[in-house]
Every structure is written in structure tokens, then in C-alpha cells.
């Protein structure tokens, strides 16, 4: 699987999950989240050659098409597969609230 | 929705479904499909700016991150959303077989 265990410990050039730290204020302009100040969101990057963790029958077809037509702009793209929630603290007035923001952290990628 | 109805009738530059015809022999090297000889597979293409048909909370975060960090390689990607099957005819010996190949045709796209 193209997950953090594999991707973070390898020098994989093809589609894989990469490390990305996002600071809520600096990178998003969000001031409403009190904690954490930022988080390891990660992101997906890398080419999607034929047979590389392809998502659907269509992804296989498109990767094979791309192999036969190297100059074509049609190609599968490396996108998130497994996403995890992020617990946050924010304030409503002076009262702290804890909430889970769903689908915030990329754990693995796929070619779609 | 970024579907064929909207995308094929507009000059949309952002993420949208685009027309693509795939010839099974020429483009994929497949000789086993008797009919059709090819089909309109379509593909997804175009940038994914903030608020443009974003798939998950993560996609929104990444698009916003990209807006604040324009040079970053981390950005959402335009990928298939709705896929449709394709009926095909192939031969087993001299006997024709009809089958539906699932997830073969792109009907709409999303930013993931």
C-alpha cells in the first residue's frame, strides 16, 4: 500500500504519500482553531505508470493509454485514498470545544 | 456538477470532464475485444482552485494551502467522480460473449 509506513521510509518516485505540515494561520489564514497550531496533513505526489496502485478499471485503461500515447494530457493522477480525522480545540465565546474534523490527514494514496 | 452536460458545452478551464476516444487496438494494444472497436472514455483535466468542486475537507484545506503557497507542489487533482460501465463483445473460442466492463467511462470529475 502507498501509505506513510512505506512512502516515508522510501525514496519512491511514483505516486506516494509525502510529508506536508500545514500551519493553520500561516498556510490557511485560519485563526479559529486554537489547538493544534498546525498538523501533518501530508499530500499525494508522483507519476502513475501502468499497474501502479490503480484505483479502477478506468485508471488501468488510462495508464495504458498514456503508455501508448506518451505526449497525451490524459493520465491518472495521484490522489488521497485513506483519510483520517483531526481533533481540534476551538472557542465558542470563552468556552473551549473539542471536535474531530473528518478527512483531514492523508494516510495513503492511489492512482485515479 | 462537472459532468458531460456542463463540461462538453462550455469552455471551462478549471477541472472538468474532457472528451477522449480510445481505440482498443491502437491506444491500448488490446485485440481481445471484438466490439466495440473503441469508445468514448473521456478524462478529467484542469486546475482545482479553492471552492471548485472539492471532494473532502482535506481537498478544501489543500486548495486553500495552495492559494497561500502558489509555488507548492501540493495541490488537489482533477479526477473521475462518476464512472459508467461499457458493454463489450469478446470471443471464447468461436462463441461470442457479452459482458459489462465496470468503471470504464467518465461522466463527471471532482477535485481530490
Amino acid at each position: 500500500a502507498l501509505d506513510t509506513n512505506y512512502c516515508f521510509s522510501s525514496t519512491e518516485k511514483n505516486c506516494c504519500v509525502r510529508q506536508l505540515y500545514i500551519d493553520f494561520r500561516k498556510d490557511l489564514g485560519w485563526k479559529w482553531i486554537h489547538e493544534p497550531k498546525g498538523y501533518h496533513a501530508n499530500f499525494c505526489l508522483g507519476p502513475c505508470p501502468y499497474i501502479w496502485s490503480l484505483d479502477t478499471q478506468y485508471s488501468k485503461v488510462l495508464a495504458l493509454y498514456n503508455q501508448h500515447n506518451p505526449g497525451a494530457s490524459a493520465a491518472p493522477c495521484c490522489v488521497p485514498q485513506a483519510l483520517e480525522p483531526l481533533p481540534i480545540v476551538y472557542y465558542v465565546g470563552r468556552k473551549p470545544k473539542v471536535e474531530q474534523l473528518s478527512n483531514m490527514i492523508v494516510r495513503s494514496c492511489k492512482c485515479s | 456538477a462537472l459532468d458531460t452536460n456542463y463540461c462538453f458545452s462550455s469552455t471551462e478551464k478549471n477541472c472538468c470532464v474532457r472528451q477522449l476516444y480510445i481505440d482498443f487496438r491502437k491506444d491500448l494494444g488490446w485485440k481481445w475485444i471484438h466490439e466495440p472497436k473503441g469508445y468514448h472514455a473521456n478524462f478529467c483535466l484542469g486546475p482545482c482552485p479553492y471552492i471548485w468542486s472539492l471532494d473532502t475537507q482535506y481537498s478544501k484545506v489543500l486548495a486553500l494551502y495552495n492559494q497561500h503557497n502558489p509555488g507548492a507542489s501540493a495541490a488537489p487533482c482533477c479526477v473521475p467522480q462518476a464512472l459508467e460501465p461499457l458493454p463489450i463483445v469478446y470471443y471464447v473460442g468461436r462463441k461470442p460473449k457479452v459482458e459489462q466492463l465496470s468503471n470504464m467511462i467518465v461522466r463527471s470529475c471532482k477535485c481530490s
Epitope: 500551519d23 494561520r25 500561516k26 485563526k31 486554537h34 489547538e35 493544534p36 497550531k37 501533518h40 480545540v89 | -
Partner: antibody
Framework: QVLLVQSGAEVRKPEASVKIFCKAS????????MNWVRQAPAQGFEWMGQ????????NYNGKFKGRLTLTADTSTNTAYMELSSLRSTDMAVYYC??????????WGQGALVTVSS | DIVMTQTPLSLPVTPGEPASISCRAS??????LAWYLQKPGQSPRLLIY???NLADGVPSRFSGSGSGTDFTLRISSVEADDVGVYYC?????????FGQGT
């Protein structure tokens, strides 16, 4: 490399005020929270507050509310901590420390504040 | 305020032996915990951030584990240079309180 250089030791009388500076270099000063922490003699640590130099936003430990003022000068990349109405229990080493990824990764060398009549 | 409780308060270890320090939070802090080492006359040095991540330049004999309320700092093989006071600190809403030190 990241460097936080603090002002020297200070001696103050009870009820006086003290203002300590922390000059930052080697990173984007405006886009990282700066924390202030103190350590009383032979004691543990006490978090006092933090400031975001980019917009001046602050979070204070309620224990110091009204006595503690955190400021930052982005033209000189310097953070300031001012504590007023000093008492003998405020005698401590005061540290500035950069906030990063659920931690304070770089600390100043500390500034000893002595409160004595 | 969240209360951080460290155990033990004192830990004599022979060089080459493993060591572990526990830190318990009075409420769920998820993975928002850091570990520091303070040597006499020095500022604290970050060892572990976000509960399990090794800070830059910290030897791999140090490791952190846990989430929620219970956390552990482990040293696989103690060296003479590891002497000092170890502190945990949470980062789950201000004030960011510390453990009392080991």
C-alpha cells in the same frame, strides 16, 4: 540556524515591573508563535503565555492575567515579556521558546529575574 | 487546567540499561505532547514532539509512545550524557502545563 537571544539578568524591587526581550533569527519570526515559560529556583516549569508576532494575537495563562503583557516588534524580530507588580514568588529564570508542531523546539538561554527589597 | 503527572520522580539507571518515564494527563490530549531534557545550567532541549516524533539531532535511542492520557519516554540504552531532568508538556489548549520532572 534558529537562534533566540535573551536580555541579561535583572534585579527588581517588589511591586516593580520587568521587561525582558528575546531577539529571534534564522526563521520567519512573524509566522511562528512565541511562548514564554518560567522556572523558579529548583522548581519545574510554568507556561506564561504566547504571542503570534504576525498579527499580535496573544494567549495568556489566567494566573498572570492583568500582570503580564506580551508584545513583538516585527521590524527587529524581537519579542518582549513584561511582568508587573512583582513579588518574591516571581523570582525565576524566564525563557522564550518558539512554538512548532506541538512543541517548543528552540529556547532562549534564559533571563534570571531577582526580586529583592 | 490539564494536570500532567510524571513517574517516577527519580530514576537511577546504570549505563547500557534501558529506562522509561511515564507521563499521565488529567484528560485526553490526543498526541499533543512533547518531552524535554534539561541539563544543569542549560535551557531545555526538545527530544520528542507530537508524542512519538524524534526531534532533529536527537539520538535514536530515545523514543516516545502513547496517545490520549498515557505517554512514555523510553531510552533503549542509557548513556552517561543522558543525565538530567526530563519533562513532559502538553499542547492541548492553553495553559500548556508541564510534568513535575524526572
Amino acid at each position: 540556524q534558529v537562534l533566540l537571544v535573551q536580555s541579561g539578568a535583572e534585579v527588581r524591587k517588589p511591586e516593580a515591573s520587568v521587561k525582558i526581550f528575546c531577539k529571534a533569527s534564522g526563521y520567519s519570526f512573524t509566522s511562528s508563535w512565541m511562548n514564554w515559560v518560567r522556572q523558579a529556583p529548583a522548581q519545574g516549569f510554568e507556561w506564561m503565555g504566547q504571542i503570534y508576532p504576525g498579527d499580535g494575537d496573544t494567549n495568556y495563562n489566567g494566573k498572570f492575567k492583568g500582570r503580564l503583557t506580551l508584545t513583538a516588534d516585527t521590524s527587529t524580530n524581537t519579542a518582549y515579556m513584561e511582568l508587573s507588580s512583582l513579588r518574591s514568588t516571581d523570582m525565576a529564570v524566564y525563557y522564550c521558546a518558539r512554538h512548532y508542531d506541538g512543541s517548543t523546539d528552540y529556547w532562549g538561554q534564559g533571563a534570571l529575574v531577582t526580586v529583592s527589597s | 487546567d490539564i494536570v500532567m503527572t510524571q513517574t517516577p520522580l527519580s530514576l537511577p539507571v546504570t549505563p547500557g540499561e534501558p529506562a522509561s518515564i511515564s507521563c499521565r494527563a488529567s484528560e485526553n490530549i490526543y498526541s499533543n505532547l512533547a518531552w524535554y531534557l534539561q541539563k544543569p545550567g542549560q535551557s531545555p532541549r526538545l527530544l520528542i514532539y507530537a508524542a512519538t516524533n524524534l526531534a532533529d539531532g536527537v539520538p535514536s535511542r530515545f523514543s516516545g509512545s502513547g496517545s490520549g492520557t498515557d505517554f512514555t519516554l523510553r531510552i533503549s540504552s542509557v548513556e552517561a550524557d543522558d543525565v538530567g531532568v526530563y519533562y513532559c508538556q502538553h499542547f492541548w489548549g492553553t495553559p500548556y502545563t508541564f510534568g513535575q520532572g524526572t
